[in-house]
């Protein structure tokens, strides 16, 4: 048969052009991209390829070795001078490894027919590629018409005698894809119809989107879809110590590229992202939530000696409310208010102070007023009770002043102004307050209520009474007003420093009306209610003392 060089050579010997070709080709062959998985690469098969040529005198394998003495499987055919060529080369069974779309990359050289004298009528410059799907690894003895044509392969670059002389070989690379595949594997076939071809390498591969970590989610190796425009949705799984609100997904394109990420993983509380992994927060650092990017130092007055802390512990005497965020400093109760002053106006007291020197690190400082009524003799104090009114209020005061009204007159009071904040109730420590002692002004006394009759005679009535319930000061004297019943316009007034009097010069057997009031430095109180007593008749004995209702 005609050799590719256009002259005859000994059978089964590689012609010169093959040697030249292989040396040039080997420099460009081996590495393939990470998103391509080879199902067959004729360059890497060490032993027999197991391919079959028919007829036997068609395609022939040229046995060559590379610089490492590894075999190079090259098939050539050059029956350009003969009519009706139909030379087939069948590969062994190729597993598709679950891929539904595969790619075939051919590297070959093709002789320019114009450079072959006398072969113009029979010489071709193309060859055909076919495939046949099969689950059977031994199903190669099939008919030609069962093969499905993939394409007619033509060379972009053909070579001439001149190229051979210059030792320049023009290696063509053609890639075709096949799909969708439905069986476990397939056979490829190459049909020569009269060309001068050297098939240097056949690489069959599928494309995958290679496993990747994106946004802390691991996406596995994913074989691309059968359709060239198809995007496969792939779920990712979160890396160790990470969580997600929205499950991470990506789309694997037919070209083996990851596209359109959806969702992401976040390092869980106590962990932060570093170099695509979730690293533990070290002692002194914390992360309260997955939504926070990185571990932060413990806020002031807090610490953690743990790894993976989600919050920090407050130092001794410092506290954190449940509503305080973990990023907030631990705080403590405020110190006492300062420079408290009072202003007494009769039975009202106005208190004023300045805020504590130490607010405890909080802005929510307020004030509480405790009121105590003190007995100046016994030195005993008791709660003031509900009759006292506080303006604007007794607790939760935001301003540094308050007015107490409806106090008792001429009474010793102690007011404790306590500063409180959001953590005061968490602290077992002593209350922080400033005390103010005040005495209310004297006021007119309350009415006398309890009057007892003493000795009653025909011309005189003796009375006694108790000090008013609320003297509101020091009682200087009492004023007793009396008149004969129904003669109110003609009354007599007696003044007494004591709580007893005797009214004399009265008419026998007559009813007299008595009213008593007390006086302090602030003035007279109101008169008591009316008390009626009757003098005895002329001849009667004087009566015993008894209480008038």
């Amino acid at each position: 048969p005609a050799s590719l060089a256009g002259c005859y050579s000994a059978p089964r010997r590689a012609p010169l052009w093959t040697c030249l070709l292989l040396c040039a080709a080997l420099r460009t062959l081996l590495a393939s991209p990470s998103n391509e998985v080879n199902l067959l690469d004729s360059r890497t098969v060490m032993g027999d390829l197991g391919w079959i040529a028919f007829p036997k005198n068609g395609w022939e394998e040229i046995g060559e070795v590379d610089e490492n003495y590894a075999p190079i499987h090259t098939y050539q055919v050059c029956k350009v001078m003969e009519q009706n060529q139909n030379n087939w080369l069948l590969t062994s069974w190729i597993s598709n490894e679950g891929a539904s779309r595969i790619f075939i990359e051919l590297k070959f050289t093709l002789r320019d027919c114009n450079s072959l004298p006398g072969g113009l009528g029979t010489c071709k410059e193309t060859f055909n590629m076919y495939y046949f799907e099969s689950d059977d690894q031994n199903g190669r003895n099939i008919k030609e018409n069962q093969y499905i044509k993939i394409d007619t392969i033509a060379a972009d670059e053909s070579f001439t005698e001149l190229d051979l002389g210059d030792r320049v070989m023009k290696l063509n690379t053609e890639v075709r894809d096949v799909g969708p595949l439905s069986k476990k594997g397939f056979y490829l076939a190459f049909q020569d119809v009269g060309a001068c071809i050297a098939l240097v390498s056949v690489r069959v591969y599928y494309k995958k989107c290679p496993s990747v970590v994106r946004h802390l989610a691991v996406f596995p190796d994913t074989i691309t879809g059968a359709d060239s425009s198809q995007l496969l949705e792939v779920s990712g799984s979160c890396v160790n110590h990470s969580v997600t609100d929205e499950p991470p997904k990506m789309h694997c394109s037919a070209e083996g590229e990851w596209l359109v990420p959806i969702g992401k993983c976040m390092c869980k509380a106590g962990y932060e992202e570093k170099n695509g992994t979730c690293q533990v927060c070290r002692p002194g650092f914390f992360k309260a939530s997955p939504h926070i990017q990185s571990c932060g130092k413990c806020p002031p007055h807090s610490y953690t000696h743990e790894e993976a802390s989600t919050s920090c512990v407050c130092e001794k005497d410092y506290f954190r409310r449940e509503s305080d965020p973990p990023t907030m400093a631990c705080t403590r109760p405020p110190s006492a208010p300062r420079n408290a002053i009072s202003n007494v106006n009769e039975t009202s007291v106005f208190l004023e102070w300045i805020p504590p020197a130490d607010t405890g690190g909080r802005k929510d400082v307020s004030y509480y007023i405790a009121c105590k009524k003190c007995n100046s003799h016994a030195g005993v104090c008791e709660e003031c009770g509900g009759h006292v009114r506080y303006l604007p209020r007794q607790s939760g005061l935001k301003n540094t002043s308050v007015m107490m009204v409806d106090l008792l007159a001429h009474t010793n009071y102690t007011f404790e102004i306590e500063a409180v904040n959001g953590v005061s109730d968490l602290s077992p420590g002593a209350r922080q307050y400033v005390s103010v002692n005040v005495t209310t002004n004297q006021a007119a006394p309350s009415p006398v209520t309890n009057v007892k009759k003493g000795k009653i005679a025909k011309n005189s009535i003796s009375l006694s009474w108790q000090e008013p319930d609320r003297p509101n000061g020091i009682i200087l004297e009492y004023e007793i007003k009396y008149f004969e019943k129904d003669q109110e316009t003609s009354y007599t007034i007696i003044k007494s420093k004591e709580t007893t009097i005797t009214a004399e010069g009265l008419k026998p057997a007559s009813v007299y009306v008595f009213q008593i009031r007390a006086r302090t430095a602030a003035g007279y109180g109101v008169f008591s209610r009316r008390f009626e007593f009757e003098t005895t008749p002329v001849f009667a004995a004087s009566s015993d003392q008894s209480q008038i209702p």
């Epitope: 070290r282 002692p283 002194g284 650092f285 130092k297 413990c298 610490y303 000696h305 743990e306 790894e307 993976a308 512990v313 130092e315 001794k316």
Partner: antibody
């Protein structure tokens, strides 16, 4: 007042075992990391082991790894150091020390130490 | 392990004078802008006492004549005006990385 008191030291033969204790008071023991540090006679300080408050993080010096075990009982406010396969070079005063609260933390309170002598 | 090397091994300084002790770490003891370097004082028969934490922070109750400086691998403890009670051994310690290694110590004597 913060106090750390070590106990359990004494004379032990090479290959023997000893368990040291460190009783803590005056602070919230369960939230503090505690360390053991030792000092051979006439020598410098050597860090031995540490344990976090919740016992989640434990570290050892290479020289004691596999032989010593640090542990704590927060209900008893006590730290322990179980020492097995003792060697002559383990002879030292053993101190327990509290990890501080001011960042970055140092060892702010130390016990008075307990002497361990390994000798035949 | 991080190796801490102190210098000098011992020094004698007059009362009222400045004393300086150096500590060099075999690798950086910094993390996130802080230096994990502590200094301790130890007197014979006593437990060590924390003087400086975080390279330059004075521990509560320590006189302000003690100060610390440095970052990365090189650190210094300075006693500005030496007093009688400062005669002791001084140790640096890194707490950036387990194990928490100490320097070999520097013995300070009063001249």
């Amino acid at each position: 007042e913060v106090q750390l008191v070590e106990s359990g030291g004494g004379l032990v033969q090479p290959g023997g075992s000893l368990k040291l204790s460190c009783a803590a008071s005056g602070f919230t023991f369960s939230t503090f990391g505690i360390h053991w540090v030792r000092q051979a006679p006439g020598k410098g300080l050597e860090w031995v082991a540490s344990i976090s408050g919740a016992s989640t993080t434990i570290y050892y010096a290479d020289s004691v790894k596999g032989r010593f075990t640090i542990s704590r009982d927060n209900s008893k406010n006590t730290l322990y150091l179980q020492m097995n396969s003792l060697r002559a070079e383990d002879t030292a005063v053993y101190y327990c020390a509290r990890y501080g609260t001011s960042f970055p933390y140092g060892l702010d309170y130390w016990g008075q130490g307990t002497l361990v002598t390994v000798s035949s | 392990d991080i190796v801490m090397t102190q210098s000098p091994g011992s020094l004698a300084v007059s009362l009222g004078e400045r004393a300086t002790i150096n500590c060099k770490a075999s690798q950086s003891v910094d993390y996130d802008g802080d230096s994990y370097m502590n200094w301790y004082q130890q007197k014979p028969g006593k437990a060590p006492k924390l003087l400086i934490y975080g390279a330059s922070n004075l521990e509560s109750g320590i006189p302000d004549r003690f100060s610390g400086s440095g970052s990365g691998t090189d650190f210094t403890l300075t006693i500005s005006r030496l007093e009688e009670e400062d005669a002791a051994s001084y140790y640096c310690q890194q707490s950036n990385e387990d194990p928490f290694t100490f320097g070999q110590g520097t013995k300070l004597e009063i001249k």
